[in-house]
Interface confidence: low
């Protein structure tokens, strides 16, 4: 004869455990039904009656089979620097992620607790390491022969154009300006240039690294936007 299927609540055999989606109630000393995701235990089981489940109220949820007396509260609304990528439902918590141009400086189990703006590299500095969802942009001074004339969280240092005759030499924050004869674009930084009879390499002024390019002592918010030049208040 096949073994008889036990219906909850039932007393488990000594040394055995309750089945999947059941839990052992210490008070009743019985195996009882868990509540499904989106529900919670309204009334716990007894020796003669099974768990009574009820739906989660608005703005609360349970994600797993459970026997909790109250559903969990959904997290607070996403802040203005975040995007809601998963809405609060009876079965799942709200998930907030950082909006474009920001990164997660302090994550939580799902989503982000604290977003910070991606650092922008100022003219004379280019992106050495792009920002990700969880890390800030790292800027570096443009090496000789390269420049960046933008304030950007994505622009890298670009090579100066090579002029037959230089009108204005390039520097870290400005491309070389050639005289009316058409320039030839230089190759990538570090590439070998074939000697040109009339080519004049544009001079390059190395920028002084800003305070924000130094490694930060902060483990939580490693970097932010680059500070303005000392003393320049713009007022």
């Amino acid at each position: 004869l096949p073994a008889q299927v036990a219906f909850t609540p039932y007393a488990p055999e000594p040394g055995s455990t309750c089945r999947l989606r059941e839990y052992y109630d210490q008070t009743a000393q019985m195996c009882c039904s868990k509540c499904s995701p989106g529900q919670h235990a309204k009334v716990f089981c007894t020796k003669t009656s099974d768990t009574v489940c009820d739906s989660c109220e608005d703005s609360t949820y349970t994600q797993l089979w459970n026997w909790v007396p109250e559903c969990l509260s959904c997290g607070s609304r996403c802040s203005s620097d975040q995007v809601e990528t998963q809405a609060c439902t009876r079965e799942q918590n709200r998930i907030c992620t950082c909006r474009p141009g920001w990164y997660c400086a302090l994550s939580k189990q799902e989503g982000c607790r604290l977003c910070a703006p991606l650092r922008k590299c100022r003219p004379g500095f280019g992106v050495a390491r792009p920002g990700t969802e969880t890390s800030d942009v790292v800027c570096k001074p443009c090496a000789p022969g390269t420049f960046s004339n933008t304030t950007s969280s994505t622009d890298i240092c670009r090579p100066h154009q090579i002029c037959n005759v230089v009108a204005i030499p390039g520097n870290a924050s400005m491309d070389a300006v050639c005289t009316s004869t058409s320039p030839t674009r230089s190759m990538a930084p570090g590439a070998v240039h074939l000697p040109q009879p009339v080519s004049t390499r544009s001079q390059h002024t190395q920028p002084t690294p800003e305070p924000s390019t130094a490694p930060s002592t902060s483990f939580l918010l490693p970097m932010g936007p680059s500070p303005p030049a000392e003393g320049s208040t713009g007022d």
Epitope: S79, D81, Q82, P211, S218, G224, T233, D235
Partner: antibody, heavy 124, light 110 residues
Framework: EVQLVESGGGLIQPGGSLRLSCAAS????????VSWVRQAPGKGLEWIGA???????YYSNWAKSRFTISRDNSKNTLYLQMNSLRAEDTAVYYC??????????????????WGRGTLVTVSS | DIQLTQSPSFLSASVGDRVTITCQVS??????LSWYQQKPGKAPKLLIY???TLASGVPSRFSGSGSGTEFTLTISSLQPEDFATYYC????????????FGGGTKVEIK
Amino acid sequence: EVQLVESGGGLIQPGGSLRLSCAASGFSLSSSAVSWVRQAPGKGLEWIGAIGSGGTSYYSNWAKSRFTISRDNSKNTLYLQMNSLRAEDTAVYYCARDPNSSDYPYGAYGMGLWGRGTLVTVSS
Amino acid sequence: DIQLTQSPSFLSASVGDRVTITCQVSQSISSYLSWYQQKPGKAPKLLIYYASTLASGVPSRFSGSGSGTEFTLTISSLQPEDFATYYCQQGYITSNVGNAFGGGTKVEIK
């Protein structure tokens, strides 16, 4: 001349609403992060919120429900709408901007330009 | 909430004294801290930004240091015009802010 001038303060009854203005001259408000800061008589500075150059508003936790910051770029003016006013909202209200044009939310490099402030008195 | 705690709240000092005010922040803010001076009936004046950069027109006797959560404002030799209230302000955290300013430190004549 680069300056900020607040207006719209005065005596208001508890529960009432008031809109303060902050007119900018000598620079474009739309390219700056500008904050509202208040100071109750004999008390410290209290940050209310700000609007970034990108147009995003930021608020302190206590101000979120009753205060709204907006901007009219055509008038080069910032506004602070205050609702359900209470006696404890009595203060001098200042607008202040970052010392550099930046799309950083507020005060990353301090607030280098301040208005003279406008007094709001909430009393019956 | 992020909290900025200034100490001391009151400070009595004499002209020529070296004065130090500290600002403790409950969360790391990298170097995004500013210091202000305020005199009665006047708007605050920016002294230092980015923790240690002197604002335009501010005397060199004022200096700032620190990063992360601990910051210091130092006045190397107190002058008669320096008797005022000083505030620190964070400009990095944008969500869950109670107040971006510290409680203030009043520097009085001894």
